[in-house]
Interface confidence: medium
């Protein structure tokens, strides 16, 4: 007789999840010398300990203890660049501008980027049929809880500037509700943080609206102000010449606006 | 967020010339539209002179046109003014600025980082 399992709304793990993980935390010590010592087996064990036999939504962040502390990596503290909603730029940056760094850039970020997972309580399995989604079931689940550890680690580290992007073709260009807006803007330290630079980043190609007036810009503004961090904010017009520019300068299209 | 730093000014004569510059630190990687403005005593923070990211868009105050001219070096991370035909009304401590876009804006309002400033004294 099948065993009764617990239907979630949200898409099941992954398929291949622990090869994808073991393979790409190879591919990640191969290409970053700094992580060579990571002991790629190791660092599946505690990832799949974190979540395995575990209710998927009763997940803590000390289950992800374990995994943090063999994928604790140094990234300079004032090259942190954040993102909200417009994760494929912000990765697109760092691919040119390669001495800053987002979440997905270390170790950890890259290993579970893009993925999902969970287990059942009390079974080895992994549920590759469905997970819980963060709304509609609930919101200590293994991939919300990994992300919500991660992007807390990763804020507390930052120092000096730390840039972010935000998506400024969204109603709301800073979500309160985002990870950005919930978890790292809270852990950012104002005693190591001088300034958080956002960059609001445009969609029209003829919106030349100063997006940085909007006011859930002026209600993060509030906030960082209060936590005695300076804040600035940008505006890029021209996301595509932006990049090309910061990827070659002297580039004769680099004369006229971004 | 960069750091801005003046230099240049000073006491000079009036019909003399003075090069100030600002020196950007912080944010190498790109650059946005960069500002002179200045203050004298006892009146608001006026809009002296403006240039694009790339340096190839410039404005002007009325009262500076023809004399002052702004340029940068984008390879130095600096932009300068440099004020020729000065006059006693110029005497102001001058600012640097960055803008929150890429273009050469006139409005104060469109800047958002500040450098501490230099005094300028021109003498009849």
């Known amino acids: 007789v099948p065993r009764w399992r617990q239907q979630w709304s949200g898409p099941g793990t992954t398929k291949r999840f622990p090869e994808t993980v073991l393979a790409r935390c190879v591919k990640y010590t191969e290409i970053h010398p700094e992580m060579r010592h990571v002991d790629c087996q190791s660092v599946w064990d505690a990832f799949k300990g974190a979540f395995i036999s575990k209710h998927p939504c009763n997940i803590t962040e000390e289950d992800y203890q374990p995994l943090m502390k063999l994928g604790t990596q140094t990234v300079p503290c004032n090259k942190i660049l954040l993102w909200s909603r417009i994760k494929d730029l912000a990765h697109q940056f760092t691919q040119v501008q390669r001495d800053m760094f987002t979440l997905e850039d270390t170790l950890l970020g890259y290993l579970a980027d893009d993925l999902t997972w969970c287990g059942e309580f009390n079974t080895s399995k992994i549920n590759y049929q469905s997970c819980p989604d963060w709304r509609k079931d609930c919101s200590n689940n293994p991939v919300s809880v990994f992300w919500k550890t991660v992007s807390r680690r990763f804020a507390e580290a930052a120092c000096d500037v730390v840039h972010v992007m935000l998506n400024g073709s969204r109603s709301k260009i800073f979500d309160k509700n985002s990870t950005f807006g919930s978890v790292e803007v809270h852990n950012l330290q104002p005693e190591k943080v001088q300034t958080l630079e956002a960059w609001v980043i445009h969609g029209g190609r003829e919106d030349s609206r100063d997006l940085c007036q909007d006011p859930t810009i002026k209600e993060l503004e509030s906030i960082i102000s209060k936590r005695n961090i300076q804040f600035s904010c940008k505006n890029i017009y021209r996301p595509d010449k932006f990049l090309q520019c910061v990827k070659n300068p002297e580039d004769s299209s680099c004369t006229s606006e971004i | 967020q960069v750091q801005l730093q003046e230099s240049g000014g000073g006491l000079v004569q009036a019909g003399g010339s003075l090069r100030l510059s600002c020196a950007a630190s912080?944010?190498?990687?790109?650059?946005?539209?960069m500002g002179w403005f200045r203050q004298a005593p006892g009146k608001e923070r006026e809009f002296v002179a403006a240039i694009n990211w790339r340096g190839s868009t410039t404005a002007y105050a009325d009262s500076v046109k023809g004399r002052f001219t702004i340029s940068r070096d984008v390879t130095k991370n600096t932009i300068y003014l440099q004020m020729n035909s000065l006059k006693p009304e110029d005497t102001a401590i001058y600012y640097c600025a960055e803008g929150r876009t890429a273009s050469a804006s006139t409005m104060i309002r469109e800047y958002d980082s500040w450098g501490q400033g230099t005094q300028v004294t021109v003498s009849e």
């Open positions: 912080g944010r190498t990687f790109v650059s946005f539209g």
